[in-house]
């Protein structure tokens, strides 16, 4: 999966929006049984925060062993710590499970920095605050790792929710969600509401805090406001989408839209930052600096390294611009835009300043592997991964952090021509998509 500031952490050609409004295809369609409504048992089933990932409680084996598992839409393996590690409170003990089956096969997953490796098997898996089902799923039992687990993160494994194409060691290893849909009546869809704190949390507060919701098999109306707008999943590997235009405070970056998707654009809950291709990042930072030019911030801040601190409660949100990403719509020549606030892209950092200070990291960073819409984007929105209809939906999250002047937004439709040209076609090679 994307590394850089990738969890596990070790941070166009599209036309201008016109007055012409197209018929919108959003929520006004026939309800499908089990897909919409209330999923009370699943609401608030995530904990954590953007900097260290969001995790859900899962049980593995018989009798069930409870583990906290990072929710990662940027990878496709279900992998859990299965040996003692200094950063793990607990781990999967295969020898204690009567239902464990060894696949007699190893798996090795390297990152730019760090790696994990383990042994493949299957076991019975359930999600206590999820659908009332148990499935036999593939599990990578992590026996060795480097810079994978995070000290104090409180999770012991990772749930890769993307498609089989990027599963390790190869696409024959069925991902958890595929197994879930095949073996049960759970609809082929899940949705995520990640709730950023908006202010620093200390360790005890994080452990006690609610981080959001993963609704498995449906959409919960209480988790969003306004309408859901859908963008096609371009290809079923990562959750790949197409960005057709980028604006900073309403000012178009005016780049060839291919640049926005070079070499892909993905929605990834396992990445902290909004990561942008080099050229796009440079243009975006230049524009953000210009919009906030009454202030000068240190160079290291824009690199995501130095923290800027304000006296508690005095963060000047108004000097920072909103950022809009226009996504390809479901209708020809139609797009919609999602707009995030500085409350999303300035990430609060705990434990550095006094209680008199609020300190933040700039959570937009440079990528060599395309655009990654990570937690800082997702924290603004309720995001529906509608695998059945090969599309991703966005609506304003009911829990997003904002102020009295501005709010995150999902708006459309906009007329945008030649959107297909915005996609980048990656040359087919044998290179690992994970070695990034």
């Amino acid at each position: 999966t994307q590394h850089g500031i990738r969890l596990p952490l070790r941070s166009g050609l599209g036309g201008a929006p016109l007055g012409l409004r197209l018929p919108r295809e959003t929520d006004e369609e026939p309800e499908e049984p089990g897909r919409r409504g209330s999923f009370v048992e699943m609401v608030d089933n995530l904990r954590g925060k953007s900097g260290q990932g969001y995790y859900v409680e899962m049980t593995v084996g018989s009798p069930p062993q409870t583990l906290n598992i990072l929710v990662d839409t940027g990878s496709s393996n279900f992998a859990v710590g299965a040996a003692p590690h200094p950063f793990l409170h607990r781990y999967y003990q295969r020898q204690l499970s009567s239902t464990y089956r060894d696949l007699r096969k190893g798996v090795y997953v390297p990152y730019t920095q760090g790696k994990w490796e383990g042994e493949l098997g299957t076991d019975l898996v359930s999600i206590p605050h999820g659908p009332n089902v148990t499935v036999r799923a593939n599990i990578a039992a992590i026996t060795e790792s480097d810079k994978f687990f995070i000290n104090g993160s409180n999770w012991e494994g990772i749930l890769g929710l993307a498609y089989a194409e990027i599963a390790r060691p190869d696409d024959s290893l069925e991902p958890f969600f595929d197994s879930l849909v095949k073996q049960t009546h759970v609809p082929n869809l899940f949705s995520l509401q990640l709730c950023g704190a908006g202010f620093p949390l200390n360790q005890s507060e994080v452990l006690a805090s609610v981080g959001g919701s993963m609704i498995i098999g449906g959409i919960d109306h209480s988790l969003y406001t306004g309408s859901l707008w859908y963008t096609p999943i371009r290809r079923e590997w990562y959750y790949e989408v197409i960005i057709v235009r980028v604006e900073i405070n309403g000012q178009d970056l005016k780049m060839d839209c291919k640049e926005y998707n070079y070499d892909k654009s993905i929605v990834d809950s396992g990445t902290t930052n909004l990561r942008l291709p080099k050229k796009v990042f440079e243009a975006a930072v230049k524009s953000i600096k210009a919009a906030s030019s009454t202030e000068k911030f240190p160079d290291g801040f824009w690199l995501g390294e130095q923290l800027v601190c304000w006296q508690a409660g005095t963060t000047p949100w108004n000097i920072f611009p909103v950022i809009s990403l226009y996504l390809m719509g479901e209708v020809t020549n139609q797009s919609f835009r999602i707009t995030i606030l500085p409350q999303q892209y300035l990430r609060p950092v705990e434990d550095v300043a006094t209680s008199q200070d609020d300190c933040y990291k700039f959570a937009i960073s440079q990528s060599s592997t395309g655009t990654v819409m990570g937690a800082v984007i997702m924290e603004g929105f309720y995001v529906v991964f509608d695998r059945a209809r090969k599309r991703i939906g966005f609506a304003v999250s009911a829990c997003h952090v904002h102020d009295e002047f501005r709010t995150a937004a999902v708006e459309g439709p906009f007329v945008t021509l030649d959107m297909e040209d915005c996609g980048y076609n990656i040359p087919q090679t044998d290179e690992s998509t994970l070695m990034t």
């Epitope: 009454t294 202030e295 160079d299 290291g300 801040f301 130095q306 601190c309 550095v352």
Partner: antibody, heavy 120, light 108 residues
Framework: QLQLQESGPGLVKPSETLSLTCTVS??????????WGWIRQPPGKGLEWIGM???????WYNPSLKSRVTISVDTSKNQFSLKLSSVTAADTAVYYC????????????WGRGTLVTVSS | EIVLTQSPATLSLSPGERATLSCRAS??????LAWYQQKPGQAPRLLIY???KRATGIPARFSGSGSGTDFTLTISSLEPEDFAVYYC??????????FGGGTKVEIK
């Protein structure tokens, strides 16, 4: 080459306002690459950051002094100033003005400093 | 709040000797740390920034190392003019307001 020079009274009475000016010569205070700051050092003690200003007028202050400090800039005179109100003997120190460079993080150029004594 | 602790408080050495000064941060400051030299009656002077980069005009005998929480200023061979007080400063959290308490390097 760029130089900084502090000026102002060396003696201030308790409860009054300390006022100092830093004159920048050999370069422009309107540089977009720098802040301009004040640091003080009580006799025989360490360094304490007071605050800093950007040519646009944007200011940052030490929270422990914020209620008493005002830093201002006059780009036409290439000067920036410090005012510290309600002074006590604890404010007796050598006051330095400095340029904040190297990615607006480090004090890369300092004035010689001026001793301000608070006494009646 | 990040606290910088310098040690030793005083270092007594002879000219030509190697001086090793330590600055420890209460939590990681990455590489955002500077060292300043202050001679009696003078303003401080920037020696090292970003933990290991020498400022303009600083002799090669001064070097900085470290990252995270532990930093070292080394003077490879003390010259008479190097006897002074040395301060570290972190700018990981900005604005740049945190200095260490200082280390005095005196002639033995």
């Amino acid at each position: 080459q760029l130089q900084l020079q502090e000026s102002g009274p060396g003696l201030v009475k308790p409860s009054e306002t300390l006022s100092l000016t830093c004159t920048v010569s050999g370069g422009s205070i309107s540089s977009s690459s720098h802040y301009w700051g004040w640091i003080r050092q009580p006799p025989g003690k360490g360094l304490e950051w007071i605050g800093m200003i950007y040519y646009s007028g944007s200011t940052w202050y030490n929270p422990s002094l914020k209620s008493r400090v005002t830093i201002s800039v006059d780009t036409s005179k290439n000067q920036f100033s410090l005012k510290l109100s309600s002074v006590t003997a604890a404010d007796t120190a050598v006051y330095y003005c400095a340029r904040v460079g190297h990615g607006v993080s480090y004090f890369d150029l300092w004035g010689r400093g001026t001793l301000v004594t608070v006494s009646s | 709040e990040i606290v910088l602790t310098q040690s030793p408080a005083t270092l007594s050495l002879s000219p030509g000797e190697r001086a090793t000064l330590s600055c420890r941060a209460s939590q990681s400051v990455s590489s955002y740390l500077a060292w300043y030299q202050q001679k009696p009656g003078q303003a401080p002077r920037l020696l090292i920034y970003d933990a290991s980069k020498r400022a303009t005009g600083i002799p090669a005998r001064f070097s900085g190392s470290g990252s995270g929480t532990d930093f070292t200023l080394t003077i490879s061979s003390l010259e008479p003019e190097d006897f002074a007080v040395y301060y570290c400063q972190q700018v990981y959290t900005w604005p740049p307001r945190t200095f260490g308490g200082g280390t005095k390097v005196e002639i033995k």
